[in-house]
Interface confidence: medium
Amino acid sequence: QEDEDGDYEELVLALRSEEDGLAEAPEHGTTATFHRCAKDPWRLPGTYVVVLKEETHLSQSERTARRLQAQAARRGYLTKILHVFHGLLPGFLVKMSGDLLELALKLPHVDYIEEDSSVFAQSIPWNLERITPPRYRADEYQPPDGGSLVEVYLLDTSIQSDHREIEGRVMVTDFENVPEEDGTRFHRQASKCDSHGTHLAGVVSGRDAGVAKGASMRSLRVLNCQGKGTVSGTLIGLEFIRKSQLVQPVGPLVVLLPLAGGYSRVLNAACQRLARAGVVLVTAAGNFRDDACLYSPASAPEVITVGATNAQDQPVTLGTLGTNFGRCVDLFAPGEDIIGASSDCSTCFVSQSGTSQAAAHVAGIAAMMLSAEPELTLAELRQRLIHFSAKDVINEAWFPEDQRVLTPNLVAALPPSTHGAGWQLFCRTVWSAHSGPTRMATAVARCAPDEELLSCSSFSRSGKRRGERMEAQGGKLVCRAHNAFGGEGVYAIARCCLLPQANCSVHTAPPAEASMGTRVHCHQQGHVLTGCSSHWEVEDLGTHKPPVLRPRGQPNQCVGHREASIHASCCHAPGLECKVKEHGIPAPQEQVTVACEEGWTLTGCSALPGTSHVLGAYAVDNTCVVRSRDVSTTGSTSEGAVTAVAICCRSRHLAQASQELQ
């Protein structure tokens, strides 16, 4: 999902510190940045979130806020501090003129400032016709554990807490932070105000139509009667949850954010902090038929982002728009004509559609998984959600062509049994943002903190790329792909796996001058090969073909073009065993695949040879896909032969541990 490269407007005001009566000046050479929503109608100028550097204490935040007020007053400007943040992010929310931004950016401790913006409920429409009875019999779905050990926080509209679907299951907190409704003639009608939140609470834990019938919920009101809220209100809500968690630690927490606004650095940062505090966040991908990476919190990597599909597993169309898509979506879930509690009366049902409903399904599934295995980390939960999803059932033709390869073809499903998945080696594919077309552009794909990067590959639609390499960054391996001259840009593709007690390293061989090509193997005792990458500095690799078949007894070896440096990912972990599987096609073909068999998990995916007509390699579930340029356009068949190389692994240690538990 989105990291630091969101498509939002960034205005960098590199301002030298003035004396201006500051007791402390900002550190030499640092510049605070200003951000605002790229979608103009959603901007809320006049209110700003001032985010301070990570280690700033509450007292310093308050002092900085007071200093801003004092300096503004000296210039004849009135300011109002609306909230001082602490617990998640240090900073404050201030109402002030935009004229004061230059001044504010020069304050000590300031990291960045973000203009407030709107967020919106992600269900369309809010009230269709009443549907009675629901399409399925209530007794057809009776899960073994209804998520009773888990608390689900819902940040949404107000709710009708005495609806029979949710009465006694949802505690309405006293948290409320919503903007005024638009329009002078707007009438607050309780049933409309409660519509969105009531329906979603019912989808998560409703007695009759809920996914996790045993889950208890807490609701926070961050959306007004028109389904509109603010980034700042959502931030304060997330802070409220964090403080509640600290005051009264309970079991696992799931936070459902069925809302979306434009890309927001600060909202994504708050989600990251809450996720790192052990909270599972689930959000709507958005209903804009657009790249989910352009929206928040959908673009936050730590959040589980959910797109919407219908009963036929097709992406949901919502009027002229529809579900968002792209690499920031983790998976899809039912989101069309979903039956749930209607706020029209305490026994009414209604159907609603949208990525909010899809996210509510996944929040319910997550609650059930966490109730069965309360110790699951966010990374483990995400991997399980992906593992148990229905694969390759979505018609990708609905998505824009350039997004199809990036969008996960996964529809959420409950595990057949909530226990017993522990033996599996879980892996997922993480795509980077697009590098952009400049000659030296690179793209970086990262795994979550408690995942291991087991392999790295790259992909370019033009075929002009310079491969990829695994490199250390901040004490962790990342996957970096390199664009080539004349290329339209590249993607880096990381294979991220859960491998407890793993010790992984990268072994590199520089380009070989010999005609045999470059080779590298895992030479440390007990280390096995989990992935191969190759990177080259030349603009275009020749058609030289290295021998594809490795000598027998050399499974721990990567082979590549003689002009490329080759990188082997070598891991040691208890009981880890891996094998190389290849599928070569002598005739030219646009796509070559090779899959790991049952019980084995794909950790590495690469192409042989690494010549320029190969667009790249990437993993889709347990299949390695190698894409080549359309031969009809290259006009050459001599370099048409391509081999897809999969590395398939399993962990005997995990299997044993699982058997001991049973």
Epitope: T132, P133, P134, A138, D139, Q142, R164, E167, G168, R169, R207, D208, A209, C345, S346, T347, C348, F349
Partner: antibody
Framework: EVQLLESGGGLVQPGGSLRLSCKAS????????INWVRQAPGKGLEWIGR????????RYNEKFKGKATISRDNSKNTLYLQMNSLRAEDTAVYYC???????????WGQGTLVTVSS | EIVLTQSPATLSLSPGERATITCRAS??????LNWYQQKPGQAPRLLIY???NRATGIPARFSGSGSGTDFTLTISSLEPEDFAVYYC??????????FGGGTKVEIK
């Protein structure tokens, strides 16, 4: 062990009023709604209303609005049913019952008989 | 207001026999239906909640089924202590709680 103990029943003159008590023990009082249900001799069960001891919120059967008032004293873990303008047809056994999840009643008091007669 | 109709009003059976009591709601109620047993001079006792879930301590011979408008309480093999009056109860909007008229299971 969860227990609900009603008291306050007896003979009442028509037009009179009375207050029934329901003492709860063996569980976290504020977490469960308490309902009052009555049963006339030889007849079925009739729901009067409920209170959420956590926030004091009440709901009533339309039939009993203005006639019945449900209240609670959290310091005593006790619920009350105040009945006014009693008539002969209000003669019944009155039960308090705990709502486990919404409106399924998992624990009941033993009941207290109220007889309205001159 | 939802009306719950129980049938039969009286069921005369011998110990060991199977008892089936039905409860029909006048409109859709999902799975929000509970069953209670009441013996003379005693308070009702919850048997089944949400149409098919046995309450704590209830023997396996009691089972509930149905959803929507038609529900059934089944006692697979009557024990002497099972002869009592059985009530169905639903959760509705106004009034929130409605009881059926009751079915008396008596010894034949």
């Amino acid at each position: 062990e969860v227990q609900l103990l009603e008291s306050g029943g007896g003979l009442v003159q028509p037009g009179g009023s009375l207050r029934l008590s329901c003492k709860a023990s063996g569980y976290t009082f504020s977490r469960y709604g308490i309902n009052w249900v009555r049963q006339a001799p030889g007849k079925g069960l009739e729901w009067i209303g409920r209170i959420d001891p956590g926030n004091g919120g009440t709901r009533y059967n339309e039939k009993f609005k203005g006639k019945a008032t449900i209240s609670r004293d959290n310091s005593k873990n006790t619920l009350y049913l105040q009945m006014n303008s009693l008539r002969a047809e209000d003669t019944a056994v009155y039960y308090c019952a705990r709502a486990n999840d919404g409106y399924s009643f998992d624990y009941w008091g033993q009941g207290t008989l109220v007889t309205v007669s001159s | 207001e939802i009306v719950l109709t129980q049938s039969p009003a009286t069921l005369s059976l011998s110990p060991g026999e199977r008892a089936t009591i039905t409860c029909r709601a006048s409109q859709y109620v999902g799975s929000y239906l509970n069953w209670y047993q009441q013996k003379p001079g005693q308070a009702p006792r919850l048997l089944i909640y949400d149409a098919s879930n046995r309450a704590t301590g209830i023997p396996a011979r009691f089972s509930g089924s149905g959803s929507g408008t038609d529900f059934t309480l089944t006692i697979s093999s009557l024990e002497p202590e099972d002869f009592a009056v059985y009530y169905c109860q639903v959760w509705d909007s106004s009034p929130p709680v409605v009881f059926g008229g009751g079915t008396k299971v008596e010894i034949k």
